[in-house]
Interface confidence: low
């Protein structure tokens, strides 16, 4: 004998991004020589048994046994979400219902606010927006590997009705560091299976210069020829070199180029040289020692630099 | 000694095209931005296009939009304007200019490095 249970198809529900195909199953096992049909949210049959009942290419038959009717959809809309019912034609007619999602896959994110010349210690606003989510997206921010805290997203139903656009700033104050840094903000969505969606916005930061000089040889002796390359860094690179030594009044103005050249080291050379390096963001002098050595192969470390 | 050179300019009838160059020497420019400027007779020097260091990033002014391409190749440490469709009003000395810093500008202010200029004459 067997149970009414034995009639009752069962099916399962689905989860689709929008876009991709989606297969619904219905089985039963005892099909007391009826056939399996489904039929849409709006209630329009879609197969009955083998045989289509909807022109709608998207629709294709998988499985059409007695005991299974399969059916797949490909290219899903949003519009397709819904309950799908399953129906057996026994009596009474017996339904399951598969319950479709649509997952909306949110747009690349769009990042505005970007103002150019930021300045060392400016504060920086940015803010990212995504559309098209279901359900809405969570954005993030970071800047290189270091997360960045912005405000919480903010969520928009967009005019469909079904999907979403979200919403995020970030506020931070920049340093010399985050000159050429990159500010990603991310979009995290279930549709996007782990999958990175996110938008870079490179930031130039203007910084006041530094430099140091380098002597070249290291330990200068008498005799040698010695260069003295004064390394400016910031942005805008510094463009500007006045090199001085220092002990004179005034200063002993010696040249304007980035490196100071002795073809022929004397002992009279010895002394403290400045190099000012200076860019439209402002100067740095910075400061070095020359004493030259005696023409012995021992090395000294007495000339220093800073 | 930085240099920027352009090329390219010349006389061609409206509806015609050029395509100017510009060469950096002295310095590897590659990591910075490069922008084009021109100048009319008797009118101040005005903005045309501009493109980041790695050319990512282009800009145009409004007269240059859908007419001319900015572009670079930075192994050549060159940077090119193509300019099609080209009218009456676009005959100026365009210069090539640089910034010390890898941001484009918009305004003459933003470069540090200009050009010497080459003239385009656009007349039938």
């Known amino acids: 004998n067997l149970s009414q249970d034995d009639s009752q198809p069962w099916t399962s529900d689905e989860t689709v991004v929008a876009g991709g195909t989606v297969v619904l199953k219905c089985q039963v096992k005892d099909h007391e020589d009826s056939s399996l049909q489904w039929s849409n949210p709006a209630q329009q049959t879609l197969y009955f048994g083998e045989k289509r009942a909807l022109r709608d290419n998207r629709i294709q038959l998988v499985t059409s046994t007695p005991h299974e009717l399969s059916i797949s959809i490909s290219n899903v809309a949003l519009a397709d979400e819904g309950e799908y019912t399953c129906s057996i034609f026994t009596m009474p007619v017996r339904t399951a219902k598969s319950l479709v999602t649509v997952l909306g896959i949110p747009q690349k994110p769009i990042i505005t606010g970007y103002k150019s010349s930021l300045r060392e210690k400016d504060t920086a606003t940015l803010n990212c927006q995504s559309s098209g989510s279901k359900p809405a997206a969570r954005l993030t921010w970071r800047k290189g590997d270091q997360e960045l805290h912005g405000e919480p997203t903010r969520i928009q139903e967009d005019p469909n009705g079904k999907t979403f656009t979200v919403s995020s700033s970030v506020t931070f104050q920049v340093t010399r560091e985050d000159d050429g840094a990159s500010i990603v903000c991310s979009v995290n969505h279930e549709s996007l299976k782990g999958a990175d969606r996110s938008t870079s916005q490179r930031i130039e930061v203007l910084y006041t210069p530094t430099a140091m000089i380098r002597p070249d040889p290291p330990h200068p002796r008498e005799g040698q020829k010695l260069l003295l390359h004064c390394e400016g860094r910031g942005n805008p690179v510094p463009q500007q070199y006045l090199w001085e030594k220092e002990g004179s009044v005034p200063p002993l103005k010696m040249t304007q180029e980035s490196a100071l050249i002795f073809p022929f080291l004397n002992k009279s050379d010895s002394g403290t040289y400045g190099c000012t390096a200076t860019s439209n963001m402002g100067s740095y002098k910075a400061y070095y020692t020359l004493n030259v050595n005696d023409p012995s192969p021992v090395p000294s470390s007495s000339s220093t630099y800073h | 000694q930085v240099q920027l050179v352009e090329s390219g300019g010349g006389l061609v009838q409206p509806g015609g095209s050029l395509r100017l160059s510009c060469a950096a020497s002295?310095?590897?420019?590659?990591?910075?931005?490069r922008g084009w400027f021109r100048q009319a007779p008797g009118k101040e020097r005005e903005f045309v296009a501009a493109?980041?260091?790695?050319?990512?990033?282009?800009n145009y002014a409004d007269s240059a939009k859908g007419r001319f391409t900015i572009s670079r190749d930075n192994s050549k440490n060159t940077v090119y304007l193509q300019m099609n469709s080209l009218r009456a009003e676009d005959t100026a000395v365009y210069y090539c200019?640089?910034?010390?810093?890898?941001?484009?500008?918009?305004?003459?202010?933003?470069?540090?490095?200009w050009g010497q200029g080459t003239l385009v004459t656009v007349s039938s």
């Open positions: 200019a640089a910034p010390a810093s890898r941001r484009p500008s918009w305004d003459a202010d933003g470069y540090d490095y």
């Open positions: 002295g310095r590897t420019f590659s990591n910075y931005a």
């Open positions: 493109i980041d260091y790695s050319g990512g990033s282009t």
